[in-house]
C-alpha cells in the first residue's frame, strides 16, 4: 500500500508539472501572437457566435492563427480562475497549416474532455495508473474533427474515474464553476463546462453516461447535447470500465448556443466518421428536420417525483412551457412510468453489475478524491455486507437501500435478465410517448450548480438525466433563466420527497445561488437528434432571444 501511494504521489507531481508546462506554452504562444498582431480586436473575435466565426474563417476575413491564438490566450486566462485545462495540445500550432479549408469547422479551436485520446497525450481520467501513458493515436471523433478543419487545442479536466457529476481529481485538482468559485462546474465533463462557460472555447466535446454533458452545461450556463448512444463514434475513448453496455455512454457537443451544437453534429455525421467507424449507423444530419418550423407537440413534467425540483427548476419549466404555448406549440402533461425502478434497479444495476469490481481496479494504490463521496468505500464492501446494510437502512433510507442492493455483483444470467428489462422498459416508455402522439418532451434539469463536493453526496439528483441514459434517448440542455432572490428564499422550505441525506445535501448545496444559470432538458426519441436540436433551438429562441445569431 505504501509503495502504491508513493507511485501515486509521483504521478501527481508529474501530472501537475506537465499541466504547468502546457499552460506556460499557451501563455507564451498567445503573447507572441499578440505582440505580432497588436491591432487584432480579440474581444470582438471572442464574442462571435460560432456560425459567424466559421463564416469569417471561410471568407478569409479572419485568419485561423488569429482565432486559435486568441482562444489559447483566453483559455489560459480563464483557467487561472477555474483550473479547467489539463494539457495544451501543442501540435495544434502545426495542425493549423494542415487544416482542410473546405471543412465545415475550418479553423475552429475545439476543446476536448480529457478522455478523448489524442496522439502523444495522456488521458489520465485523474487516475495515477494512466499518468505517463500517451495515446498511440487520435480517437475517431478527434480524427474527424481534424478532417473537418477543426483544431483541437486543449484537454479539459474530469472527476477521478469520471463516475461523478463533480469535477476534481488527485492529479490536477479541483475545477470550479466560472460563475461562482464555491460552486461545482458539474461533471464529468466539468472542465469543458467551465472552459466554454467562461468563453475560453467556442466548442467542445464531452461524454455522458448519467448526465455528464448535461450537468456541466446546466451548471455553467451553456448548451449541451447527449445523442443516442451510438450516433457518434466512441472508438478510441479512454474509460475505466469497458464492456458495460446496459447503460449507454454517449459522445456529444457542448457550446454557447444551439446552432453551434447543430454545426458540430453536421460536421461529425459525415462519410469520414462512417468510414473510420463502420459500427456507427451511417445517418447523415437531416437538415430538413432541424430547420422545420412545424408546431410541435410537447410532453412536459415539472417533477419526476424522485428529486424534488428546486424552485428555480420548476419555474424554468413553467416559463418555458408558457412561452412554447404562446408560440403555438401544444403542451401535454407526460411522465414516463416507473422512474424509481429505472434508476435504482435498471441503471444502478447495469452500471455496477459486477459489484464495481472492474471500476475498483483503477484505484489500486491511488488516492480517492473527496468529490466521489463514499462510492469507492461502498463498492469495496463485501457482497454480504452490501446486502445486510441495504436491509438495515431500508426503513429509514429506502433510496440508499435500493442503490446499495443493486450494487451487488450478479451472474451473467441475471445481467441478461436486467438488460431484457431495460429493453422492455424502453418499449413501454416509447408506447406511452406514442399514445400521446408527442414529438418531444420538456423536463426539468438539475440546477443551479451545487457547492463543491456536494454532488458526491447527492446521488439521487441524477434522476432527471440518468433516466435518458437508461432509455438511450437523445437529450439536450438549454439555459433559460437565472436564480432569483425569490427562488432563493423559497429554497429555505425545500425538503425533498424523502428527507434523506441526499435531499438534505441538495438543499444545503444549492444555497447562495442568486444569479446562477438554470436550464431545462429537451428530449426526443432514439436517433432523433435533429428534432431534439430543433426543439432546443425553439426553446432558446423563445427564452433567450438575444442568443439567436442572425
Amino acid at each position: 500500500r505504501w509503495s502504491g501511494r508513493r507511485t501515486a504521489r509521483g504521478a501527481v507531481v508529474r501530472a501537475r508539472q506537465r499541466q504547468r508546462a502546457g499552460l506556460e506554452n499557451m501563455d507564451r504562444a498567445a503573447q507572441r501572437f499578440r505582440l505580432q498582431n497588436p491591432d487584432l480586436d480579440s474581444e470582438a473575435l471572442l464574442a462571435l457566435p460560432l456560425p459567424q466565426l466559421v463564416q469569417k474563417l471561410h471568407s478569409r476575413e479572419l485568419a485561423p492563427e488569429a482565432v486559435l491564438f486568441t482562444y489559447v490566450g483566453k483559455a489560459w486566462e480563464v483557467n487561472k480562475g477555474t483550473n479547467c485545462v489539463t494539457s495544451y495540445l501543442a501540435d495544434c500550432e502545426t495542425q493549423l497549416s494542415q487544416a482542410p479549408r473546405q471543412g465545415l469547422l475550418y479553423g475552429v479551436p475545439v476543446s476536448l474532455k480529457e478522455c478523448f485520446t489524442y496522439k502523444g497525450q495522456d488521458s489520465t481520467l485523474g487516475l495515477s495508473l494512466n499518468e505517463g501513458v500517451p495515446a498511440e493515436c487520435d480517437s475517431v471523433v478527434v480524427h474527424v474533427l481534424k478532417l473537418q478543419g477543426a483544431v483541437p487545442f486543449v484537454h479539459t479536466n474530469v472527476p477521478q474515474s469520471m463516475f461523478s457529476y463533480d469535477c476534481s481529481n488527485p492529479l490536477f485538482g479541483q475545477t470550479v464553476n466560472p460563475w461562482k468559485s464555491s460552486k461545482s462546474p458539474g461533471g464529468s465533463s466539468g472542465g469543458e463546462g467551465a472552459l466554454i462557460g467562461s468563453g475560453g472555447s467556442p466548442l467542445g466535446l464531452g461524454t455522458d453516461i448519467g448526465g455528464s454533458i448535461r450537468f456541466p452545461s446546466s451548471f455553467c450556463g451553456i448548451c449541451g447535447l447527449k445523442p443516442t448512444g451510438n450516433r457518434l463514434s466512441k472508438s478510441g475513448l479512454k474509460g475505466c470500465v469497458y464492456g458495460q453496455e446496459a447503460v449507454r455512454l454517449s459522445v456529444g457537443p457542448m457550446a454557447r448556443d444551439v446552432e453551434s451544437l447543430a454545426l458540430c453534429l453536421r460536421a461529425l455525421l459525415c462519410e469520414d466518421m462512417f468510414r473510420l467507424d463502420p459500427t456507427v449507423p451511417p445517418l447523415p444530419f437531416r437538415e430538413e428536420v432541424y430547420t422545420s418550423s412545424q408546431p410541435l407537440r410537447v410532453g412536459y413534467y415539472e417533477t419526476d417525483n424522485y428529486t424534488m425540483p428546486s424552485p428555480a427548476m420548476r419555474r424554468a419549466v413553467l416559463e418555458t412551457k408558457q412561452s412554447l404555448e404562446a408560440a403555438g406549440h401544444t403542451l401535454v402533461p407526460f411522465l414516463p412510468s416507473n422512474i424509481p425502478h429505472a434508476l435504482e434497479t435498471l441503471s444502478t444495476g447495469g452500471l455496477f453489475s459486477d459489484g464495481g469490481h472492474t471500476f475498483l481496479q483503477n484505484f489500486k494504490g491511488d488516492f480517492v478524491d473527496p468529490c466521489l463521496g463514499d462510492l469507492v468505500s461502498i463498492l469495496k464492501l463485501p457482497q454480504w455486507l452490501k446486502g445486510l446494510l441495504a436491509f438495515l437502512v431500508k426503513p429509514l433510507l429506502p433510496r440508499l437501500s435500493a442503490f446499495l442492493s443493486n450494487m451487488k455483483s450478479r451472474s451473467a444470467g441475471k445481467l441478461w435478465e436486467l438488460q431484457h428489462e431495460i429493453e422492455v422498459y424502453r418499449k413501454t416508455v416509447i408506447a406511452q410517448w406514442r399514445a400521446l402522439d408527442l414529438d418531444v418532451v420538456l423536463t426539468p434539469m438539475l440546477a443551479p450548480a451545487l457547492d463543491l463536493n456536494a454532488p458526491g453526496r447527492a446521488t439521487g439528483a441524477v434522476s432527471y438525466t440518468m433516466l435518458y441514459n437508461c432509455l438511450d434517448f437523445p437529450a439536450g440542455v438549454v439555459p433559460v433563466t437565472t436564480v432569483t432572490a425569490e427562488d432563493e428564499a423559497q429554497m429555505e422550505h425545500y425538503r425533498g420527497y424523502f428527507g434523506d441525506i441526499w435531499d438534505k445535501m441538495l438543499q444545503k448545496g444549492m444555497k447562495k445561488s442568486v444569479g446562477l444559470p438554470v436550464a431545462v432538458q429537451c428530449v426526443a426519441l432514439p436517433w432523433q437528434e435533429e428534432l431534439c436540436l430543433r426543439f432546443m433551438r425553439e426553446v432558446e429562441r423563445l427564452m433567450t432571444p438575444e442568443k439567436q445569431s442572425s
Epitope: E319, Q322, S323, E325, A326, G328
Partner: nanobody, 110 residues
Amino acid sequence: VQLVESGGGLVQAGGSLRLSCAASGRTFSDNTMAWHRQGPGKQRGLVAFITTGGRTVYTDSVKGRFIISRDNAKNTGFLQMNSLKPEDTAVYYCYVAGNWGQGTQVTVHH
C-alpha cells in the same frame, strides 16, 4: 378567458396600426399573452409575446417595427405596428392561456 381583438384595418405601406386584445376573466395577468398571424395561404405563426414579467419576444421579421405591451389593470394587450409592409397583411389573433380570439384583419397596400 374570452378574447376580443380590435384595431385592424386597411393601411398604406409605411403606415402604423395599434391592435388591442381585451380579455374577460381573471387569468390575464397570470399568463403570457401573444399575437399570432395567418397570411393568405400561410400557416398561423407567432408574431410576438409578452410574459407576466414583461419579457418580450419577437419573430425576426417584425423586430424593430412592432412593439407588444400589456396593461394588466385593464386586462388588455396591445400590438403597436409601425413601418408596415405588404407582407404584414394577415389576420392577427390574440392568444392567452390556451384561448384564441376570433382575429382582426390587417391589410397593407402599396
